[in-house]
């Protein structure tokens, strides 16, 4: 079964600064990555990043620069311009495009514990949805 | 399929502002991020920005920013671009396009005369 | 911002010849992550808006005729038309998908004799 992973760290230079990390887990090929945050894909979840394998990347403020990793896997740079952080607390979710599977998201947030420069475990959040 | 329908020619006058209106229908994975593209003389072909239906969020190339404003309506679908203070120069067709370029509205041509 | 160099800036050829024309990017478009090129290549009739042909560099786009093809990396990119027909008539552009802003080229003339 296809499995999305996702990692939320903070930078640990910059406390404002925050990475999001996805992969994809699985047979198929990608079609397109979303990246959203406050909830998943069409269910309340904001979009701030959409990537597409030959077309090219895009995101939106607070998203700094989206990326792909590897074939499967992508990166998303956000910058937090408030002085409190709502990165924090925020959950962002992952929903990969994948021919022929369909489509499979997970959500993950920064642990509360969490120190700079350390991640979340790579374990979805069971919002794992398949379309 | 995705149509973008974009509204009619424009004739203002210098130091006018306008306002270019771009509807979309149909279904596309990435909803309806808009891209605005300015063609002047018939061929050079300019990108201005985009804009995310999500949040209103938008994307400027650094030369039209205080020249364009780009906003969405996104219960109707349409994406708006308001130009400033224009002049002969802003004369051009107005393209609004998907997100990855692959659909185009038919543009919208805007005549700065006094 | 990226500068989008195309040539010529326009050719005349017979139906059924092929045609080759040139891009070049002031800076590879080359995707290290994935290793895709985001290049674009389009094509504008008269009176009409562009339409997108190629992406990826070398992808076609649905129902673009397989006369069409796009190749290259970095910074070079080719069109090729392997026999050209009446309706390839247009303007040809490349555009640069990997940085914003999304520079295009200045365009290829295509004229049929």
């Known amino acids: 079964t296809p499995e999305v992973w996702v990692q939320v760290q903070m930078e640990a230079t910059e406390l404002s600064s925050f990475t999001v990390h996805c992969g994809f887990l699985g047979p198929g090929s990608i079609s397109l990555v979303t990246v959203s945050w406050g909830g998943p894909d069409g269910a309340g979840g904001t979009k701030l990043a959409v990537l597409h394998p030959e077309l090219g990347t895009r995101q939106w403020a607070p998203a700094r620069q989206a990326r792909w990793e590897t074939q499967s896997s992508i990166s998303l740079a956000l910058e937090d311009s408030g002085a409190s952080s709502p990165f924090a607390n925020t959950t962002f979710c992952c929903k990969f495009a994948s021919f022929p599977e369909g489509s499979w998201e997970s959500c993950g947030s920064l642990p509360p514990s969490s120190d700079p420069g350390l991640s979340a475990p790579p374990t979805p959040v069971p919002i794992l949805r398949a379309d | 399929e995705v149509q973008l329908q974009q509204s009619g020619p424009e004739v203002v006058k210098p130091g006018a502002s306008v306002k270019i209106s771009c509807k979309a229908s149909g279904n596309t994975l990435t909803d309806y991020f808009i891209n605005w593209v300015k063609q002047s003389h018939g061929k050079n072909l300019e990108w201005i920005g985009d804009i995310n239906p999500d949040n209103g969020a938008g994307n400027y190339n650094q030369k039209f920013k205080g020249k364009a404003t780009l906003t969405v309506d996104k219960s109707s679908g349409t994406a708006f671009m308001g130009l400033r203070s224009l002049t002969s120069e802003d004369s051009a067709v107005y393209y609004c396009?998907?997100?990855?370029?692959?659909?185009w509205g038919q543009g919208t041509t805007l005549t700065v005369s006094s | 911002d990226i500068v989008m160099t195309q040539s010529p800036s326009s050719l005349s050829v017979s139906t059924g010849e092929k045609v080759t024309m040139s891009c070049r990017s002031s800076q590879s478009l080359l995707n290290s992550g994935n290793q895709k090129n985001y290049l674009a290549w389009y094509q504008q009739k008269p009176g009409q808006p562009p339409k997108l042909l190629i992406y990826g560099a070398s992808t076609r786009e649905s129902g673009v005729p397989d006369r069409f093809t796009g190749s290259g990396s970095g910074t070079d990119f080719t069109l090729t038309i392997s026999s050209v027909q009446a309706e390839d008539l247009a303007i040809y552009y490349c555009?640069?998908?990997?940085?914003?802003?999304?520079?295009f080229g200045g365009g290829t003339r295509l004229e049929i004799k």
């Open positions: 555009q640069n998908a990997h940085t914003s802003p999304y520079t």
């Open positions: 396009a998907t997100l990855y370029f692959d659909y």
